[in-house]
């Protein structure tokens, strides 16, 4: 039988966006595999990703079902062929992730403005409601579902010809913003979660800007 | 129709090798991985081991590990166990059969009809 | 390894009765547990998986349920057809375990 030694997993990570989440680790497998488990702090490990090769799981499905829980992980190593094993007998080598709660910790997506529309000198800016994994009563959770009023989005505006930028703030998907006629203005939005401490912004959206509204204005 | 079909009993000698084969049909090889069970006459039912298909990465229970040796052959959808170092207490049904994959549960869905191998001097 | 034990190892029941077996786990296995029959002569089949999800095919008179590490299998009407013996496996901790069976008899 080989002589290559089974290794404990390493650097054991989340990777999370918007309730997407992925156990990554290292190193990758030579003759061994991996399993891993998954466990609330009160809860029973379940395993996933059973004797794979990969050096990721997607945990998703099991942290969506309660996503203010705090998780854990743990990656279990096989020897894969005719491979001893080093862990004491009995006893398969493994290794803890650190602690993760979705509802704090996940990273928040780049938002998308969905739509602007001119209203006289106002301007109706729309962000899209992302949907989530986040499930409920079989129907799939949009981030603001989830995070109700946690949730703020913030507009950064310009006009085309300056570089001053305005802001905004609003708890819902949708801003109201004054405007000067027949200026043409840019947008970009940001989510922004004010009561975590950490991992609190979302990236910038794409910025888009208007074209000239001299024809909806009716000049 | 998704079916895994075994090769026919043996008789070995103790100290001798058997090389058992399992071929599968009616669903994408890859995608599954296959376990080999066994059961003693009048025993239940023992995991001796799992290949994965897609790359022949093959895992086995510790109580085999040294003996078995599980292999595929992508090209005709087919996988055998080796068994080597025969002993009396080997004598069992070798059964295949299709259990899940790396995200699903590790359930017997589909089984071979076995084959007997007997070891007697 | 985890240990499965199951109980009764065989039982005698009438056709119509109500028949239950055990399985337990020597430690916390999830729901990752399956059930299945194996009829004289044949390999076996799968019935339940993962504790308490019925496989296609298999009438509903076969039930599964959990509470903790105790896992139960439910015949709701014993049928003639429901002669073999049943076995229960984990799959959560490596190596895969099998519990020692149950032999179902008609009276």
């Known amino acids: 039988s080989g002589t290559t030694n089974t290794v404990a997993a390493y650097n054991l990570t989340w990777k999370s966006t918007n309730f997407k989440t992925i156990l990554e680790w290292e190193p990758k497998p030579v003759n061994q595999v991996y399993t891993v488990q998954i466990s609330t702090k009160s809860g029973d490990w379940k395993s996933k990703c059973f004797y794979t090769t990969d050096t990721e799981c997607d945990l998703t499905d099991e942290i969506v079902k309660d996503v203010k829980q705090t998780y854990l992980a743990r990656v279990f190593s096989y020897p894969a062929g005719n491979v001893e094993s080093t862990g004491s007998a009995g006893e398969p080598l493994y290794e803890n992730s650190p602690e993760f709660t979705p509802y704090l910790e996940t990273n928040l997506g780049q938002p998308t403005i969905q739509s602007f529309e001119q209203v006289g000198t106002k301007v109706n800016v729309t962000v899209e409601d992302e949907r989530t994994l986040v499930r409920r009563n079989n129907t799939f959770l949009s981030l603001r579902d989830v995070f109700g009023k946690d949730l703020i989005y913030t507009l950064y505006y310009w006009k085309s010809s300056s570089s001053g930028k305005k802001t905004a703030k609003t708890n819902t998907n949708e801003f109201l913003i004054d405007v000067d006629k027949g200026e043409n203005y840019c947008f970009s939005v940001q989510a922004v979660i004010f009561s975590r401490k950490t991992n609190h912004k979302s990236p910038e959206s794409i910025t888009k800007c208007t074209e000239q509204w001299k024809s909806v204005l009716g000049e | 129709q998704v079916q895994l079909v075994q090769s026919g009993a043996e008789v070995k000698k103790p100290g001798a090798s058997v090389k058992v084969s399992c071929k599968a049909s009616?669903?994408?090889?890859?995608?599954?991985?296959m376990h080999w069970v066994r059961q003693a006459p009048g025993q239940g039912l023992e995991w001796m081991g799992i290949?994965?298909?897609?790359?022949?990465?093959?895992v086995y229970a510790q109580k085999f590990q040294g003996r078995v040796t599980m292999t595929r052959d992508t090209s005709t959808s087919t996988v055998y166990m080796e068994l080597s170092s025969l002993r009396s207490e080997d004598t069992a049904v070798y059964y295949c059969a299709r259990g899940g994959s790396k995200v699903a549960a590790l359930a017997f869905d589909i089984w071979g009809q076995g084959t007997m191998v007997t070891v007697s001097s | 390894d985890i240990q499965m034990t199951q109980s009764p190892s065989s039982l005698s029941a009438s056709v119509g009765d109500r028949v239950t077996i055990t399985c337990q786990a020597s430690?916390?296995?999830?729901?990752?547990l399956n059930w299945y029959q194996q009829k004289p002569g044949k390999a076996p089949k799968l019935l339940i998986y993962d504790a308490s999800n019925l496989e296609t095919g298999v009438p509903s008179r076969f039930s599964g349920s959990r509470s903790g590490t105790d896992f139960t299998f439910t015949i709701s009407s014993l049928q003639p057809e429901d002669i073999a013996t049943y076995y229960c496996q984990q799959y959560n901790f490596h190596p895969l375990t099998f519990g020692g069976g149950t032999k179902v008899e008609i009276k």
């Open positions: 290949i994965n298909p897609s790359g022949g990465i093959t």
């Open positions: 009616g669903y994408t090889f890859a995608n599954y991985y």
């Open positions: 430690q916390d296995i999830s729901n990752s």
